[in-house]
Interface confidence: low
């Protein structure tokens, strides 16, 4: 007789999600003998890289690589040693690096080079660091959500693969520098750039996706700050009693605030700005972020971008979840309808700094920004994307599914490691009793 070696029990994959405000590392695992099953890949562990995103290291590229060391050291411990060499490692950068690439391509290249240098020092199967397009970010987020919720195919008790009838879920992602909306649609695309055709497990999917650069939470806050400096001597979205010194260089260095940038300004000047707790003026300020004046297609979302009518149920994750969760949990406000979401935003915007601090003890940092965040989410969904009360009823705000963070990272890895076959598995699993 000869020894029969057991197949390796688990495989692992690592994705570094290099967002605009921070980087997160996700380690995924799956049974090696079930690679083509759906919903079989799950999150093994994760790690938040402290500090800013890699794009914040434009002046210090080596620091971008160095910043990842703590999490990579954790990966060495979290992935069994004998699996290190066979574990694919990817880094994907999103809108923060897309912005840096627009304004300073040399710095963008230097940051990616530095990050690559660090990642190649580790014993994993490093497969590249690159900037994702907005379209990829949207589609991979959609793939992640539907994969985790097992919306693509299901494994029946008779051992046959079948596609469930529940359909797919749309995905809405609110990052730091961009926001994405992606959903399955039957409408033909009037703008080919917004349509993606996918073949997964033998099924064909026509998906609409669009990424709005500069509409991520952090960039929106910067743009509102720039607008407040331009049009008011106060910030209507900040609470009354809150005051801070704003460094003009920080406000105007982003390409997202270029429209509000004065012809000449002292980048090292500090301007004192106070809040006024004015929900109506804040709403007006947020409204100014959206343009509905021209649409070259039969219908648009905003800024002249084609969008078919929203259809089906949606999962809204990342900062959509954090914003709504703050209203729901920290503030104790109902947000089940669009009307309630608007009322909740107004409620937060009405609070003074002292009232907010009393309502949410121990969470003072950035507390002043929740009003603007809530107002933006409400306007983006209702006016921007065109959700009415009925459609909004089908939106769930959730950051995890099947104990795994929802975001583009898992979908990206599934795609690059071919863990979702285009065609259904050739062999049936189990026994056929029919």
């Amino acid at each position: 007789t000869r020894d029969i070696r057991e197949p390796p029990a688990l495989k692992y994959g690592i994705v570094l999600d290099a967002g605009s405000s921070h980087t997160s590392m996700f380690i995924y695992k799956w049974p090696a003998d079930k690679e083509n099953d759906t919903g079989i890949v799950g999150q093994h562990s994760s790690c938040d890289v402290p500090g800013g995103g890699i794009s914040s290291y434009a002046d210090n590229p080596s620091g971008a690589g160095q910043s990842l060391v703590g999490c990579l050291e954790q990966a060495l411990r979290d992935v069994p040693k004998e699996r290190h060499a066979g574990t694919p490692l990817y880094l994907g950068a999103t809108a923060g690096m897309r912005l840096l690439n627009l304004t300073n391509p040399e710095a963008s290249t230097s940051v990616l080079t530095a990050v690559t240098h660090t990642l190649t020092q580790y014993p994993f199967d490093f497969r590249g660091a690159r900037i994702l397009s907005g379209q990829e970010e949207g589609v991979f987020g959609w793939v992640t959500a539907n994969y985790l919720l097992e919306n693509f195919i299901k494994y029946g008790w008779v051992g046959r693969w079948f596609r469930p009838r529940k359909g797919t879920l749309g995905a809405m992602d609110l990052g730091g520098a961009s926001t994405q909306i992606t959903f399955e649609t039957t409408s033909p695309a009037e703008d080919r750039a917004s349509e993606v055709q996918l073949r997964l497990y033998g099924q064909h999917y026509r998906v609409y996706t669009h990424s709005f650069l500069c509409y991520g939470r952090d960039q929106v806050l910067q743009r509102l700050l720039a607008s407040a400096l331009q049009t008011h001597s106060f910030h209507p979205c900040w609470p009354r009693g809150f005051s801070t010194h704003v460094l003009l260089g920080d406000v105007y260095q982003s390409p997202c605030t270029v429209a509000q940038r004065p012809q000449t300004f002292n980048s090292s000047a500090r301007v004192s700005l106070s809040g006024s707790s004015d929900p109506h003026l804040c709403r007006d300020l947020v409204s100014g972020l959206f343009s509905f004046s021209s649409c070259p297609f039969s219908r648009c979302s905003f800024n002249g971008v084609f969008q078919p009518p929203v259809a089906g149920n949606f999962i809204a994750f990342s900062a959509f979840f954090y914003t709504v969760n703050f209203l729901r949990t920290s503030m104790g406000l109902p947000v089940a309808t669009l009307q309630q979401l608007e009322a909740a935003a107004v409620n937060v915007c009405n609070q003074t700094w002292a009232q907010l601090q009393a309502r949410v003890p121990g969470q003072q940092a950035h507390l002043a920004d929740y009003c603007a965040g809530a107002m933006f989410v409400q306007q983006l969904l209702s006016r921007g994307y065109g959700f009415d009360e009925r459609a909004f009823g089908g939106v769930i705000f959730q950051k995890k599914a099947a104990d795994t963070a929802v975001g583009w990272a898992l979908g990206y890895m599934l795609n690059l490691t071919n863990l979702i076959p285009a065609d259904p598995p050739g062999l049936r699993k189990g026994t056929d009793f029919s």
């Epitope: 405000s21 921070h22 938040d48 890289v49 402290p50 500090g51 800013g52 914040s56 290291y57 002046d59 210090n60 620091g63 160095q66 910043s67 990842l68 060391v69 703590g70 954790q74 411990r77 979290d78 939470r217 801070t244 990342s318 900062a319 979840f321 954090y322 914003t323 121990g362 969470q363 940092a365 950035h366 950051k399």
Partner: antibody
Framework: QVQLVQSGAEVVKPGASVKISCKAS????????MDWVKQAPGQRLEWIGD????????TYNQQFKGKATITVDKSASTAYMELSSLRSEDTAVYYC??????????????????WGQGTLVTVSS | EIVLTQSPATLSASPGEEITLSCSAS?????IHWYQQKPGQAPRLLIY???NLASGIPARFSGSGSGTFYTLTISSVEPEDAAVYYC?????????FGGGTKLEIK
């Protein structure tokens, strides 16, 4: 109340090792990382490393890799740091510090909210 | 690593005076914390995330700043404020501290 109590001062010979302890009380020990910080005479504070007591995961400042080993005894709510191959430049006060945090939009922001009283380690022949 | 430079190294102030301590980073950081250390004692958290007052810290302490420049202000110095003040960044690994500013009360 939340307290970190460290072991007493140590005088050790060059080349030897020393293990100092930090006993936590007043909170759930496994809910917070424990960090160690060095303060040499006339020098700035230096972060050495930390440990996640829940998962026994430690991370080190590259400068202290091989010098410091951080461990925990969960049942005793105690963190330990062993310093090896001691030299005169290791003479310092060593602090344990609890890593406090707050969550904002899903990102953890960290700081040292509670400190031990410090342990003086003197390396002398 | 990010180097934090604090100035002045030593500062002498009279009770009731307003003073400002500065902390300059060698490259941009997201936020910083401030700690106070009195002789023979461990450091104590004063301000976290640039401008948030830690529990039990008097309102005369305030912090501000962004990017590479941060300040700690004491609006009306009291005798018990005599201490060394350290800034600390948690934006870039390894986490680093400033060299400290020693505040003496006249």
């Amino acid at each position: 109340q939340v307290q970190l109590v460290q072991s007493g001062a140590e005088v050790v010979k060059p080349g030897a090792s020393v293990k100092i302890s930090c006993k936590a009380s007043g909170y759930t020990f496994t809910d917070y990382n424990m960090d160690w910080v060095k303060q040499a005479p006339g020098q700035r504070l230096e972060w050495i490393g930390d440990i996640n007591p829940k998962y026994d995961i430690s991370t080190y400042n590259q400068q202290f890799k091989g010098k410091a080993t951080i461990t925990v005894d969960k049942s005793a709510s105690t963190a330990y740091m062993e310093l090896s191959s001691l030299r005169s430049e290791d003479t310092a006060v060593y602090y344990c510090a609890r890593r406090g945090f707050f969550l904002y939009y899903g990102i953890n922001y960290y700081y040292f909210d509670v400190w031990g009283q410090g342990t003086l380690v003197t390396v002398s022949s | 690593e990010i180097v934090l430079t604090q100035s002045p190294a030593t500062l002498s102030a009279s009770p009731g005076e307003e003073i400002t301590l500065s902390c300059s980073a060698s490259s941009s950081v997201s936020y910083i914390h401030w700690y106070q250390q009195k002789p023979g004692q461990a450091p104590r958290l004063l301000i976290y995330s640039t401008s948030n007052l830690a529990s039990g810290i008097p309102a005369r302490f305030s912090g501000s700043g962004s990017g590479t420049f941060y300040t700690l202000t004491i609006s009306s110095v009291e005798p018990e404020d005599a201490a060394v003040y350290y800034c600390h960044q948690w934006s870039s690994y390894p986490w680093t501290f400033g060299g400290g500013t020693k505040l003496e009360i006249k």
